[in-house]
């Protein structure tokens, strides 16, 4: 996955502080794989800025070179800047690493807009605020790029956490997480809590803001409230799931559910927006406009281009509807729904108007490559990537932004028949024709 419409950090009031978490149900505790309870060393290990992605600190090579790496569940390569670039403060210097091994193979990754290319190798990698292990992993040393690195984003590479099937140049290049699980006793599961900020940040604040947590090897119960609901991973390439129903303020969009997953639906931390297939996007925007009709906004706002500003602290959250996505459940004919607030899908933008205003971009957009549940969705929830059991879990994030009237929600079960029919079967084509870019 790569930016363009990929990546952020935000939303209204923070959740309850640690120690004041709401009680949660523990009925599924025995089923959860991996270490349970506290992963104190991994909590708050992500940073980021609105629209520019969440990154974790990693070290590469011997002696260790520290880099900030974008966490991307929508791709499968570990790739780092390895040559000077105007937007990079630092980069991986292979010649300084005694443990670097050259694979004598190049890699080229084009996106809808932009690209990166580099040279493949392996080296020792660790995550300082992660599990206390060091693994030998494949690394793409980026030597040339275009519209990939973001000025001021503070990250120098990308950690693709999806499956080998979408790795470049081909599926024989083992992704980082596969290497981590193979070489250690770490359970095959990770979870993400992307927090956002909820209000526009100036540059100083943005650099200092907490972005969230990547828990490697398990689930941290302090990061969510209520219970976790799981949806099957349909196919292990992207983190593909099936959406069975969509509602705006409780009103069903009433579309053939295949449309919601045309040509796939994925969970992607490397994309900023909630991206919807063209037909679904048009129906959703029509419904959101109708729900918020006491105020009118220009077309450019609904296209995600123009910003709308309100006097600081007076954003009329109440006029904007909630968006609910129903996901296939683990039990036959059973689904559950995740509901996000406008505090998630209106993305704060800093430095455009005056300090007396709060300005936002509409962060739901159109896609030609299926539904992408990007940071706009993920910022509402604690998301568990349970690779061991081929499922993704959602619970209400303890840090999600809400107001006194509404909160993000994960609710179920709901009876939904024929959910298998909601999946779109992509016609078999040569793998090389797959679209890489997620603009």
């Amino acid at each position: 996955t790569h930016l363009g419409i990929r990546l952020p950090l935000r939303s209204g009031l923070a959740g309850p502080p640690l120690g004041l978490r709401l009680p949660r149900e523990t009925d599924e505790e025995s089923e959860e794989p991996g270490r349970r309870g506290s992963f104190v060393e991994m909590v708050d290990n992500l940073r980021g800025k609105s629209g520019q992605g969440y990154y974790v600190e990693m070290t590469v090579g011997s002696p260790p070179q520290t880099l900030n790496i974008l966490v991307d569940t929508g791709s499968s390569n570990f790739a780092v800047g390895a040559a000077p670039h105007p937007f990079l403060h630092r980069y991986y210097q292979r010649q300084l690493s005694s443990t670097y091994r050259d694979l004598r193979k190049g890699v080229y990754v084009p996106y809808t807009q932009g690209k990166w290319e580099g040279e493949l190798g392996t080296d020792l990698v660790s995550i300082p605020h992660g599990p206390n292990v060091t693994v030998r992993a494949n690394i793409a040393a980026i030597t040339e790029s275009d519209k990939f690195f973001i000025n001021g984003s503070n990250w120098e590479g990308i950690l693709g956490l999806a499956y080998a099937e979408i790795a470049r140049p081909d599926d024989s290049l083992e992704p980082f997480f596969d290497s981590l699980v193979k070489q250690t006793h770490i359970p095959n599961i990770f979870s993400l809590q992307l927090c956002g900020a909820g209000f526009p940040l100036n540059q100083t604040e943005a650099l200092a803001s907490v972005g969230g947590s990547m828990i490697i090897g398990g689930i941290d119960h302090s990061l969510y409230t209520g219970r976790l609901w799981y949806t099957p991973i349909r196919r292990e390439w992207y983190y593909e799931v099936i959406i069975v129903r969509v509602e705006i303020n409780g009103q069903d969009l009433k579309m053939d559910c295949k449309e919601y997953n045309y040509d796939k639906s994925i969970v992607d931390s490397g994309t900023t927006n909630l991206r919807l297939p063209k037909k679904v996007f048009e129906a959703a925007v029509k419904s959101i406009k109708a729900a918020s009709s006491t105020e009118k906004f220009p077309d450019g706002f609904w296209l995600g281009e123009q910003l709308v500003c309100w006097q600081a602290g007076t954003t009329p959250w109440n006029i904007f509807p909630v968006i609910s996505l129903y996901l296939m459940g683990e039990v036959t004919n059973q689904s559950f729904r995740i509901t996000i607030l406008p505090q998630q899908y209106l993305r704060p933008v800093e430095d455009v108007a005056t300090s007396q205003d709060d300005c936002y971009k509409f962060a739901v957009s159109q896609s030609s490559t299926g539904t992408v549940m990007g940071a706009v969705i993920m910022e509402g929830f604690y998301v568990v990537f349970d690779r061991a059991r081929k499922r993704i879990g959602f619970a209400v994030s303890a840090c999600h932004v809400h107001d006194e009237f509404r909160t993000a929600a994960v609710e179920g079960p709901f009876v939904t028949a024929d959910m298998e029919d909601c999946g779109y079967n992509i016609p078999q084509t040569d793998e090389s024709t797959l679209m890489t870019g997620r603009a």
Epitope: F301, Q306, L307, C309, C359
Partner: antibody, heavy 120, light 108 residues
Framework: QLQLQESGPGLVKPSETLSLTCTVS??????????WGWIRQPPGKGLEWIGN???????YYNPSLRSRVTISVDTSKNQFFLKLSSVTAADTAVYYC????????????WGRGTLVTVSS | EIVLTQSPATLSLSPGERATLSCRAS??????LAWFQQKPGQAPRLLIY???NRATGIPARFSGSGSGTDFTLTISSLEPEDFAVYYC??????????FGGGTKVEIK
Amino acid sequence: QLQLQESGPGLVKPSETLSLTCTVSGGSISSSSYYWGWIRQPPGKGLEWIGNIYYSGSTYYNPSLRSRVTISVDTSKNQFFLKLSSVTAADTAVYYCARLGHGYNYFDLWGRGTLVTVSS
Amino acid sequence: EIVLTQSPATLSLSPGERATLSCRASQSVSSYLAWFQQKPGQAPRLLIYDASNRATGIPARFSGSGSGTDFTLTISSLEPEDFAVYYCQQVYVWPPRTFGGGTKVEIK
């Protein structure tokens, strides 16, 4: 065709409240296609946006004037209004009402403007 | 805050000449920019919207171009009635709020 006409006192005393009316003729102020706005221009100077209103009553104000401005609408009379409190000589200007069209983006139709002088 | 800087402040030209007016934004406003013409004692009139689209009834000699931060209003051949003050306005940040300082096109 649609026309806008500003009206109100041409002279206001310092510290008092400036009140203007914009009357819309030849069309309905309740059209869902438009916002309605106020812009002012001090003598010999540039344009300054004051604020906008939608027929539902939803308002947006210039942050620099927000504490002193109120814009309201009366759909039954096809009029919208400007009130600017605690005026000083710096508020002396030609005040224009205008329609925000082209998808709520651009001031595509303006009144002729009315000069308001703040002086004791 | 987005600031719009117009240049030159004054442009002295003769009828029939080509006029090129510039408007520069302090940060990208995409194509969300308008140009207005104001004659003495009159209200401004919308000439160009969305950077390059002529408003209804505006003669073809007026054209707008640019996107991002740099915009140009061109009057291909000045007519006597074109001598006026021209303002740009951005609407990338909505509601529309920021006008440029203006360029006066005067007879040489």
